[in-house]
Interface confidence: medium
């Protein structure tokens, strides 16, 4: 007779990252009998839900249950019927909820609620809707990406899973770019972490780990540009904002009250005489790259070294993912190769954002002109970030690793907050056994 | 700018039928949905029923069974079909559209029409 698979004895776990500029809903599969296993969980289907961060929906919160509808109905459908009940649901709202909660901690409460009522409505074991901090942002995305790259296994392995896998259990150090934060998470090589708050315990899988970590809110790409923005508008003698940071022949027209509405722009508020002002670019990496170090705060630092902004930051160590817009956008400019050089990415940086706007949108036809004219800032801000911001050097970048997707899961906080959620990290190492159970009979 | 125009409303007896029409003046595909919201004399707009891009639709409790919207993206057309009509479904009723997101992190435009009468009286 032929032989015939058993009913898939799985779990699911759903998690959904409301980010700044958009929501995405994430289904986690596993097999049942291998929770404490590492490496067991995996991604079966990511859903973008259509539309802006969940901190827009202020003014109209009765419309945040037609905007999750599509991705929560996916979701239904992707998981079995029999599995509904038991599947948990989770949502964290990251670094645009953070911001609007510093406006007004009602509204953001408003929003949260609106959130948790939607989603109750669905068959699945909805677990709420909360804020993260920036720092479980940061560990549940090195949690992430060691988690898919098997360094918390003791096993140690002949072959390498991913290209840039190396074969120890050295872990890779995390950096997350969202739109309104972003994360730098990484072991420290023997250095005692200065400032408590960038600190971090874990006991996993029968190890300790000292880890550093610490989230730059304002500083993801999106609140960035709006920085620069108020902080160039400053200077700018008329309503003509001649901007280095987009292509020549590039106009866009801000409006000042756009401009002053984030917190992240207070710092540079002043009254102008204009209520609108028009951005024409001239496409000038040299000058944008300088425009964007103005950004951050180099010559304060109260510890051995520093960050920006006066925050502490180690040594650099070891090999770094850079997930989330990093990938994305150096993706999109071809940039993420291992073979690259910071050097090269430098030279054809200068080379996009030189390049006319007409032909930047014949080259690109295919792409949504408002996100296509933000490449060249979004480029330019990596390279400042990294490279001055956390002191990469030509040398070190060949250990920053543009990463997508680890073994078919993205790279992200969602994935290391579920696995915490649900109790499936062990600070033990699990008895192994010798045989898992049969699937065929 | 996008010009959203309703027709279709009108007097009708309580248990009749009416179906109202949403033209929109450029391709609808790219709005995250589209919806009817409806407001009485005196009270607050409400959300009556909304489509999704991905064509999946909610509806306010009030209206569930009876009206059921609908569109048609080759003519650029959301439809409200209304049956079982009551006295308390009178209203102005407004087409709204959820633009596609916008410049680095921006809010997304609303679109509204200008509304259309519905009475339902015997």
């Known amino acids: 007779t032929q032989n015939k698979a058993l009913p898939e004895n799985v779990k699911y776990g759903i998690v959904l990252d409301a980010g700044s500029s958009h929501t995405s809903l994430y289904i986690y599969k596993w097999p049942a009998e291998k929770e404490n296993d590492t490496g067991v969980v995996h991604q079966v289907e990511e859903c973008r839900v259509k539309g802006p961060g969940i901190s827009k929906f202020v003014q109209k919160v009765n419309e945040i249950g037609i905007y999750l509808t599509d991705c929560m109905e996916r979701a239904r459908e992707v998981i079995p019927r029999s599995q509904h009940q038991e599947t948990p649901v989770y949502l964290g709202a990251t670094a645009g909820m953070r911001l609007l909660r510093m406006e007004s901690e009602e509204l953001a409460d408003r929003v949260l609620d609106v959130v948790e009522r939607s989603l109750s409505n669905y068959p699945f074991d909805f677990q709420g809707a909360r804020i993260i901090t920036g720092q479980e942002e940061g560990a549940y995305g090195w949690i992430t990406i060691n988690y898919l790259l098997g360094k918390f296994s003791q096993k140690t392995r002949w072959f390498s899973i991913v290209p840039y896998e190396t074969n120890n259990q050295e872990t890779f150090g995390a950096l997350d770019l969202g739109g309104a934060s972003t994360q730098v998470t990484f072991v420290p090589q023997n250095q005692t972490i200065e400032s408590p708050d960038n600190a971090l315990q874990f006991r996993l899988y029968g190890k300790d780990y000292n880890v550093y970590t610490h989230s730059f809110l304002c500083y993801g790409k999106d609140q960035a540009l709006w920085q620069k923005l108020a902080k160039d508008i400053q200077v700018a003698s008329n309503e003509i904002l001649r901007d280095p940071c987009f292509h020549p022949g590039y106009k866009k027209v801000v409006n000042v009250s756009d401009l002053y509405k984030t917190p992240c722009t207070k710092r540079f508020e002043m009254t102008l005489p204009f209520q609108q002002f028009e951005i024409q670019g001239i496409g000038n990496y040299q000058q944008c790259h300088q425009s964007i170090l103005e950004l951050f705060n180099t010559s304060y630092c109260p510890y051995s070294q520093c960050a920006f902004n006066g925050i502490f930051l180690p040594p650099l160590q070891g090999d770094f993912g850079a997930f989330s817009a990093f990938y994305f956008v150096m993706k999109f400019l071809n940039l993420t190769s291992e073979k690259v050089s910071q050097e090269k990415v430098t030279e054809m940086m200068k080379k996009f954002c030189a390049q006319p706007w007409e032909e930047i949108k014949t080259s690109y036809a295919g792409v949504k002109e408002k996100y296509l004219s933000e490449y060249c800032f979004s480029g330019t801000y990596i390279l400042s970030l990294l490279l001055q911001g956390y002191h990469f050097t030509a040398d070190s970048w060949e250990h920053i690793h543009f990463i997508g997707k680890i073994q078919g899961s993205d790279a992200g906080w969602t994935l290391g907050y579920m696995l915490n959620l649900t109790n499936m990290i062990p600070a033990e190492q699990p008895l192994s056994t010798p045989l898992s159970h049969s699937t065929y009979v | 700018q996008v010009q959203l125009v309703e027709s279709g409303g009108g007097l009708v007896q309580p248990g009749g039928s009416l179906r109202l029409s949403c033209a929109a003046s450029?391709?609808?595909?790219?709005?995250?949905?589209m919806g009817w919201y409806r407001q009485a004399p005196g009270k607050q707009r409400d959300l009556v029923a909304a489509?999704?891009?991905?064509?999946?639709?909610n509806y306010a409790e009030s209206v569930k069974g009876r009206f059921t919207i609908s569109r048609d993206d080759a003519k650029n057309t959301v439809y409200l079909q209304m049956n079982s009509l009551k006295p308390e479904d009178t209203a102005v009723y407004y087409c709204h559209a959820i633009g596609g997101s916008t410049w680095f992190g921006e809010d997304e435009p609303d679109y509204w029409g200008q509304g259309t009468q519905v009475t339902v009286s015997s």
């Open positions: 450029e391709s609808i595909v790219s709005f995250n949905a």
């Open positions: 489509i999704t891009s991905g064509g999946r639709t």
